[in-house]
Interface confidence: low
């Protein structure tokens, strides 16, 4: 269930997809990846106020309990709901290989 | 990929399953749920230090970028990896019904 997409904190403040540019060095991949030299990493960033993009029943419960017991129960967290695949050209002992990673780039975000 | 289960912050501090007792009133369910009157809600709570229980490649990337750009990229977050089903006895117009919810109680946790 995808709950309210209206962000009560103002435009762009709540859980959404962001793009962060990263080099192979930033990612610690320089030793084993040849290409791409730079990755446009899509990630889920932002706040999860009450019922905003609640992923499921668990997220709704978390919101309720966070309101009651903020020191014990954290607010829901902005995480990927799905991913886009990405192909990396990797170094191997014999040369190079193409490897597809299905869990690398966030495609869509929700709160959980 | 499930990465390191050793918590560098000390026992019990990192992402793990916690049980939080909640009444129907706490959950805002008093109007539509008859039973149980109290729920032992299992949730994922705790810190996600570097590579601790990293759910996938995205979580590993997030850790690396959080270290480099803590202001821009949040640390990975402790969320359910799987759920346990739970049966609720619900009020209906004609009486009661049993409904199974598959996404209510966390079963296992990871960082993402």
């Amino acid at each position: 269930a995808r709950n309210g997409d209206h962000c009560p904190l103002g435009p762009g403040r709540c859980c959404r997809l962001h793009t962060v540019r990263a080099s192979l060095e930033d990612l610690g991949w320089a030793d084993w990846v040849l290409s791409p030299r730079e990755v446009q990493v899509t990630m889920c960033i932002g706040a999860c106020p009450s019922q905003f993009r609640a992923a499921n029943m668990h997220a709704q419960i978390k919101t309720s309990l966070h309101r009651l017991k903020p020191d014990t129960v954290p607010a829901p967290c902005c995480v990927p709901a799905s991913y886009n695949p990405m192909v990396l050209i990797q170094k191997t002992d014999t040369g190079v290989s193409l490897q597809t990673y299905d869990d690398l780039l966030a495609k869509d975000c929700h709160c959980i | 990929a499930r990465n390191g289960d050793h918590c560098p912050l000390g026992p019990g501090r990192c992402c793990r399953l916690h049980t939080v007792r909640a009444s129907l009133e706490d959950l805002g369910w008093a109007d539509w749920v008859l039973s149980p009157r109290e729920v032992q809600v299992t949730m994922c709570i705790g810190a996600c230090p570097s590579q601790f229980r990293a759910a996938n490649m995205h979580a590993q990337i997030k850790t690396s970028l959080h270290r480099l750009k803590p202001d821009t990229v949040p640390a990975p977050c402790c969320v359910p990896a799987s759920y346990n089903p739970m049966v609720l006895i619900q009020k209906t117009d004609t009486g009661v019904s049993l409904q199974t919810y598959d996404d209510l109680l966390a079963k296992d946790c990871h960082c993402i």
Epitope: T19, P49, R67 | T72, P74
Partner: antibody, heavy 112, light 109 residues
Framework: QQLKESGGRLVTPGTPLTLTCTVS????????MSWVRQAPGKGLEWIGD??????TTDYASWVKGRFTISKTSTTVDLRIASPTTEDTATYFC????????WGPGTLVTVSL | DIVLTQTPASVEAAVGGTVTIKCQAS??????LAWYQQKPGQPPKLLIY???TLASGVPSRFKGSGSGTEFTLTISDLECADAATYYC???????????FGGGTEVVVQ
Amino acid sequence: QQLKESGGRLVTPGTPLTLTCTVSGFSLSDYYMSWVRQAPGKGLEWIGDIYGGSGTTDYASWVKGRFTISKTSTTVDLRIASPTTEDTATYFCGRGITADIWGPGTLVTVSL
Amino acid sequence: DIVLTQTPASVEAAVGGTVTIKCQASQSISSYLAWYQQKPGQPPKLLIYKASTLASGVPSRFKGSGSGTEFTLTISDLECADAATYYCRCIYGDSYGAAFGGGTEVVVQ
């Protein structure tokens, strides 16, 4: 790691004005940058911010198009489209979500 | 928009004493709160972020606590140099800054 605001001066109402925050010692692309103002004898007021990586902007709800934030590789600009006497204040830029580094401020006086 | 209400507006205390400043948010902001110190003619200085984490170089006499809607800044073993105005600020989420509280002036006798 430093910030320095410039461009503050005495202007008449309605005269557009651009303030500049020049950064040194760190990469703008890694941070959110905020503009905050303080009228004489009053408290701090958040105007808006820009993500140095993508240029995404966010503004306080009261801004309503009166201010525009933009960036280059080493500067963040605040344009006041049509200043009024209520915009008389010291304008500060701050680095990051937490504003861990601030410039000394630049004074804007709007007067007939 | 989130509104932060700071109390008291002004407080006096003696050197060596303790001051407590409260900040109330109009809705839960988890632990996304920062505290700043500002002296006349100077920009604000970050003291505490994420409600309780001490910023680099800030003495441990400054302590932040709270979560949800109620937050507190406690300054113990007051020094003359602590005379300033203190502001709380919502830093909701991990991507954006936001509103400030109205400020609390601390006078050290």
